[in-house]
Amino acid sequence: ARNGDHCPLGPGRCCRLHTVRASLEDLGWADWVLSPREVQVTMCIGACPSQFRAANMHAQIKTSLHRLKPDTVPAPCCVPASYNPMVLIQKTDTGVSLQTYDDLLAKDCHCI
Amino acid sequence: ARNGDHCPLGPGRCCRLHTVRASLEDLGWADWVLSPREVQVTMCIGACPSQFRAANMHAQIKTSLHRLKPDTVPAPCCVPASYNPMVLIQKTDTGVSLQTYDDLLAKDCHCI
């Protein structure tokens, strides 16, 4: 149940998909990945104010308790709701293989 | 792939399951839930240092990019990996019903 999609903090400030360009070196992959040399990493970044894109009942509880006990209970966090698959050309003991990873790139985001 | 379970920040400081006692009033449920009057809410709280309980490849990427660009990319976040179901006795138009919720109580935690 993704509750609200209106961000009360202003445009682009709340939990949403961002793209970050990263090299194999940035990712620490240079020793085992041959291609791509650079990845457009999609990730979930932004604030999770009250009921914004609440993933489930747990997220709603977290919002309520954070309001009551902000020092004890953190606000919900912006994380992937689903992923886009991606292939990597990776080194193997004998050469290379094309491997699919289902959990690399965020597809959309929610707060939990 | 839950990488490390050793917390480099000291015992209890990293992402783990916590229990927070909350009343129906705390949760904003008093108008639609009859029982329980109080809930032992299990939730995921704590830091996610490098590779600690990394949920997947995305979490590992996030760790690497946070190290490089801490102002742009946040560290992974401590969220539920799974949930325990819970029943609520809730008010209905005609009386009460016993309803099971599968996404209320965190069962275990990981970093993502």
Partner: antibody, heavy 118, light 107 residues
């Protein structure tokens, strides 16, 4: 497992156009890094790369043939199409499609034969 | 466009022998050269990526080397099933281009 199957070949009149289809299974064209390419081989000759299309709809074409080629995809149908206009006798060839992962062309179809003749 | 030139056009040799094929690029392509095998009536089979990396399932008797403009493909000990046409291809930049092929035939 990965399979590709070309169709749409046959006899084409000079000056006409051809539309080839490549139906595939075992992979998805919505996967980052995946593409489908077209390569042809004239009778008794070598291989000639024609075009390819990526998961993000980026397209690349053989320089000499660019003006005559169109490539498109239907991700939901797992199909890639190649259209060639103003065909001539020298376009007679076996046309292959291949699965691509970045710059790897690792799986190929068995090819469809196109004959340009009046 | 980058021109890939293979030599020899035909290599006549015997089973058990070593076969060495050459491929030259018209400009520097770093290590971005692939090799394919094609048998009559069949589609090409992908063998070598980025000059020297064998693809999954390719036997160890196939190997590649080189960088810049000069590349070599070697079959250490020819098996009967290895007699075929071999193509090099540059994957450094589009348009991707193939060499003319080397036919490895039984002597």
């Amino acid at each position: 497992q990965v399979t590709l199957l070309e169709s749409g070949g046959g006899l084409v009149q000079p000056g006409g156009s051809l539309r080839l289809s490549c139906s595939f299974s075992g992979f998805s064209l919505s996967t980052y890094g995946i593409g489908v390419g077209w390569i042809r081989q004239a009778p008794g000759k070598g291989l000639e790369w024609l075009a390819h299309i990526w998961w993000n709809n980026n397209k690349y074409f053989n320089t000499a043939l660019k003006s005559r080629l169109t490539i498109s995809k239907d991700t939901s149908k797992n199909t890639v199409y190649l259209q060639m206009n103003s065909v001539r006798a020298e376009d007679t060839a076996v046309y292959y499609c291949a699965r691509m992962g970045y710059d790897i062309m690792d799986y190929w179809g068995q090819g469809t034969t196109v004959t340009v003749s009046s | 466009d980058i021109v890939m030139t293979q030599s020899p056009a035909t290599l006549s040799t015997s089973p058990g022998e070593r076969a060495t094929l050459s491929c030259k690029a018209s400009q520097d392509v770093n290590t971005a050269v692939a090799w394919y095998q094609q048998k009559p009536g069949q589609a090409p089979r992908f063998l070598i990526y980025s000059s020297s990396y064998r693809y999954t399932g390719v036997p160890a008797r196939f190997s590649g080397s080189g960088s810049g403009t000069e590349f070599t493909f070697t079959i250490s000990s020819l098996q009967s099933e290895d007699f075929a046409v071999y193509y090099c291809q540059q994957h450094y930049s589009t348009p991707w281009t193939f060499g003319g092929g080397t036919k490895v035939e039984i002597k």
